[in-house]
């Protein structure tokens, strides 16, 4: 008799999830000598332990504590790049500017990037059919709680000048409901962080507007200023040229505005 299974509104666990996490862990620890001490089997066991046999709408930050302990990693606190709704460009940037880090450049972020996972209450099975959607089902699901936990710690780690890349093509350039807007902004520590510098990335080639004057950017400035952190904003009119100039800063065309 087939067992009744909860149907959630979101996609199910990414296929080959255990193998993917383990393989990513091995690859990461091979590339990053400072993380060679990490036992990837223990990392997978801790990851699995956070959600297996638990109701996927009842996950807590404490569930991820063993994984977070194993994934402890020092990042240069003054080289942190946050992003919102523009992950690909942020990652392209840190692949070129190797001394700067997004969350996905850390072990924990790298393990989980673009993956979905959930289990079922009282069974050791991974649910490959469906997982809870943050809006339609519940917010305390395994994926959302994971990103909230690691994003909070990442923001808390930051110091000096923190950069954030924002998508200027979206109706809400700064979105209070994004992970950046709801978690990271509120966990930057004013005693450590002097300035948040926003880079607003333009989409259209002929878009010469000053998107730093956008109402949502003014809202971000207000939130940050109230937290006793300075705010600055730059338009990146040509993201392709911006990346090119990060690669080749001596290029004569890189002295003009990008």
């Amino acid at each position: 008799v087939p067992r009744w299974r909860q149907q959630w509104s979101g996609p199910g666990t990414t296929k080959r999830f255990p193998e993917t996490v383990l393989a990513r862990c091995v690859k990461y620890t091979e590339i990053h000598p400072e993380m060679r001490h990490v036992d990837c089997q223990s990392v997978w066991d801790a990851f699995k332990g956070a959600f297996i046999s638990k109701h996927p709408c009842n996950i807590t930050e404490e569930d991820y504590q063993p994984l977070m302990k194993l994934g402890t990693q020092t990042v240069p606190c003054n080289k942190i790049l946050l992003w919102s709704r523009i992950k690909d460009l942020a990652h392209q940037f840190t692949q070129v500017q190797r001394d700067m880090f997004t969350l996905e450049d850390t072990l924990l972020g790298y393990l989980a990037d673009d993956l979905t996972w959930c289990g079922e209450f009282n069974t050791s099975k991974i649910n490959y059919q469906s997982c809870p959607d943050w809006r339609k089902d519940c917010s305390n699901n395994p994926v959302s709680v994971f990103w909230k936990t690691v994003s909070r710690r990442f923001a808390e780690a930051a110091c000096d000048v923190v950069h954030v890349m924002l998508n200027g093509s979206r109706s809400k350039i700064f979105d209070k409901n994004s992970t950046f807007g709801s978690v990271e902004v509120h966990n930057l520590q004013p005693e450590k962080v002097q300035t948040l510098e926003a880079w607003v990335i333009h989409g259209g080639r002929e878009d010469s507007r000053d998107l730093c004057q956008d109402p949502t950017i003014k809202e971000l400035e207000s939130i940050i200023s109230k937290r006793n952190i300075q705010f600055s904003c730059k338009n990146i009119y040509r993201p392709d040229k911006f990346l090119q100039c990060v690669k080749n800063p001596e290029d004569s065309s890189c002295t003009s505005e990008i």
Epitope: T72, Q73, T74, P76, L108, R153, E156, A157, C159, K192
Partner: nanobody
Framework: QLQLQESGPGLVKPSETLSLTCTVS??????????WGWIRQPPGKRLELIGS???????YFNPSLKSRVTISVDTSKNQFSLKLSSVTAADTAVYYC????????????????RGQGTLVTVSS
């Protein structure tokens, strides 16, 4: 709950070495669960990180102070200490010891726990 308490002289002469100790209670300085550091706040200025020390003994120092700073751990007394050599009046500040949880991504600046602070004046 982890608690930290700074101790040391409140007055140091120019060119001498400032020495401070931080006594930890509620946790072990040798535990892999924490990392430790020193922070200071000169009068009217922002807090600045002096340096930090991690489980296993690796250290990070503020580049502007690096040549003058030593941070060490004494596991028998459950303490860690700061030595800052060749001090000048610019080193007058409130000095804080601090601790951080080794939990996920962490920076060089521990900020999960902090002592009350001790004022050190550099003057002859």
């Amino acid at each position: 709950q982890l608690q930290l308490q700074e101790s040391g002289p409140g007055l140091v002469k120019p060119s001498e070495t400032l020495s401070l100790t931080c006594t930890v209670s509620g946790g072990s300085v040798s535990s892999s669960s924490y990392y430790w550091g020193w922070i200071r706040q000169p009068p009217g200025k922002r807090l600045e990180l002096i340096g930090s020390i991690y489980y296993g003994g690796s250290t990070y120092f503020n580049p502007s102070l690096k040549s003058r700073v030593t941070i060490s751990v004494d596991t028998s007394k459950n303490q860690f200490s700061l030595k800052l050599s060749s001090v000048t009046a610019a080193d007058t500040a409130v000095y804080y010891c601090a601790g951080g949880d080794t939990y996920g991504p962490v920076g060089q600046w521990p900020s999960d726990y902090r002592g009350q602070g001790t004022l050190v004046t550099v003057s002859s």
